[in-house]
């Protein structure tokens, strides 16, 4: 015998009390897939959460975070306090980035400044708590007579004519 519940579309549930009739989900609930025997309770966006989209008969409510907080996790499952640029969130609250680190966002952690010398470059603009350093040309490129134009053509080996 075919399960009549499989015919029930999203937004309904299969009502066993009524010979497997498809009944619409009641208020404050939804079903996102067909064939469900119960509807799921709608998420409520309360406290630090605010509603981005209310619950429909086929989809759960979508939440955002109130001003001063940002979403973390899948489907904004958590709200984390914002900090200022140049800060990171610790267990004791927002703390300034230590010297040599920066954070250019209201969330996340302070990251070390780029080490320009690792790329053979020099620091063009110093870093701050809010901004990374800006690397410039290597010191050798800045020596007198050095040109930033096209590099010189390679020397030809003796006895070879150009192709």
């Amino acid at each position: 015998l075919q399960d009549l519940c499989s015919n029930c579309p999203a937004g309904t549930f299969c009502d066993n009390n009524r010979s497997q009739i498809c009944s619409p989900c009641p208020p404050n609930s939804f079903s996102s897939a067909g064939g469900q025997r119960t509807c799921d309770i709608c998420r409520q966006c309360k406290g630090v959460f605010k509603t981005r989209k209310e619950c429909s008969s086929t989809s759960n409510a979508e939440c955002d975070c109130i001003s001063g907080y940002h979403c973390l996790g899948a489907e904004c499952s958590m709200c984390e306090q914002d900090c200022k640029q140049g800060q990171e969130l610790t267990k004791k609250g927002c703390k300034d980035c230590c010297f040599g680190t920066f954070n250019d966002q209201k969330r996340g952690i302070c990251r070390p400044w780029t080490n320009c010398s690792l790329d053979g470059k020099s620091v063009l603009v110093n870093g701050t708590k809010e901004r990374d350093v800006v690397c410039g040309p290597s010191p050798a490129d800045l020596s007198p007579g050095a040109s930033s134009a096209t590099p010189p053509a390679p020397a030809r080996e003796p006895g070879h004519s150009p192709q």
């Epitope: 009944s23 009641p26 208020p27 404050n28 609930s29 509807c39 209310e54 619950c55 429909s56 008969s57």
Partner: antibody
Framework: QEQLQESGPGLVKPSQTLSLTCTVS??????????WSWIRQHPGKGLEWIGY???????YYNPSLERRVAISLDTSKNQFSLNLNSVTVADTAVYYC???????????WGQGTLVTVSS | SYVLTQPPSVSVAPGQTARMTCGGD??????VHWYQQKAGQAPVLVVY???DRPSGIPDRFSGSNSGNTATLTISRVAAGDEADYYC???????????FGGGTKLTVL
């Protein structure tokens, strides 16, 4: 599927109480957590929500009417009722009973019954 | 309490597209339903959950909802579409049902 049918007097005198009953057929009124609502429409005007009740007996009412209105459930008869007291000519309207389902959607509606307030 | 605003009337020639608006503060986060009411009859649900249609409602009826405006669109309008159209939401702050004032669609 559920069907709803309003019943009650079509004529009420001013200052008296308007009483209507909605009979639900094709389903149980106390199952599944649906809300059971009354809505009215004055002649030539728009729809006005009166209130609703749900299975716990809790009810919500339109603030403009809440001092005069009461909605009740009678699960043994599969009915819910509207009482509107101290009526005036301004309460003359077509009164609809209806079920509220997910996301506040109103479905189905009763066919409506005209109640005239007149001496 | 939450307020929904609809234009009192919209006129359209047969075969054209009718658009009826429903304005409300940040209505885009809410779920909007639309009802058609012909003279002397009870309202009939034509669009629910912003843009879904109940079975039996032709696909000429569609809805959209964003920002401060929800819209009911009827394409290829026919004389039989002449009716009053009401938008409706559930105001979750107050747990109240809210209707717009209704729009009378006239088919020229």
């Amino acid at each position: 599927q559920e069907q709803l049918q309003e019943s009650g007097p079509g004529l009420v005198k001013p200052s008296q109480t308007l009483s209507l009953t909605c009979t639900v057929s094709g389903g149980s009124i106390n199952s599944q957590g649906y809300y059971w609502s009354w809505i009215r429409q004055h002649p030539g005007k728009g729809l006005e929500w009166i209130g609703y009740i749900y299975d716990s007996g809790s009810a919500y009412y339109n603030p403009s009417l809440e001092r005069r209105v009461a909605i009740s459930l009678d699960t043994s008869k599969n009915q819910f009722s509207l009482n509107l007291n101290s009526v005036t000519v301004a309460d003359t309207a077509v009164y609809y009973c209806a079920r509220i389902v997910a996301a506040g959607r109103i479905d189905p509606w009763g066919q409506g019954t005209l109640v005239t307030v007149s001496s | 309490s939450y307020v929904l605003t609809q234009p009192p009337s919209v006129s359209v020639a047969p075969g054209q597209t009718a658009r009826m608006t429903c304005g409300g503060d940040n209505i885009g986060i809410k779920i909007v339903h639309w009802y058609q009411q012909k003279a002397g009859q009870a309202p009939v649900l034509v669009v629910y959950d912003d843009n879904d249609r109940p079975s039996g409602i032709p696909d000429r009826f569609s809805g959209s909802n964003s920002g401060n405006t929800a819209t009911l669109t009827i394409s290829r309008v026919a004389a039989g579409d002449e009716a009053d159209y009401y938008c409706q939401v559930w105001d979750r702050r107050s747990d109240h049902v809210v209707f717009g004032g209704g729009t009378k669609l006239t088919v020229l």
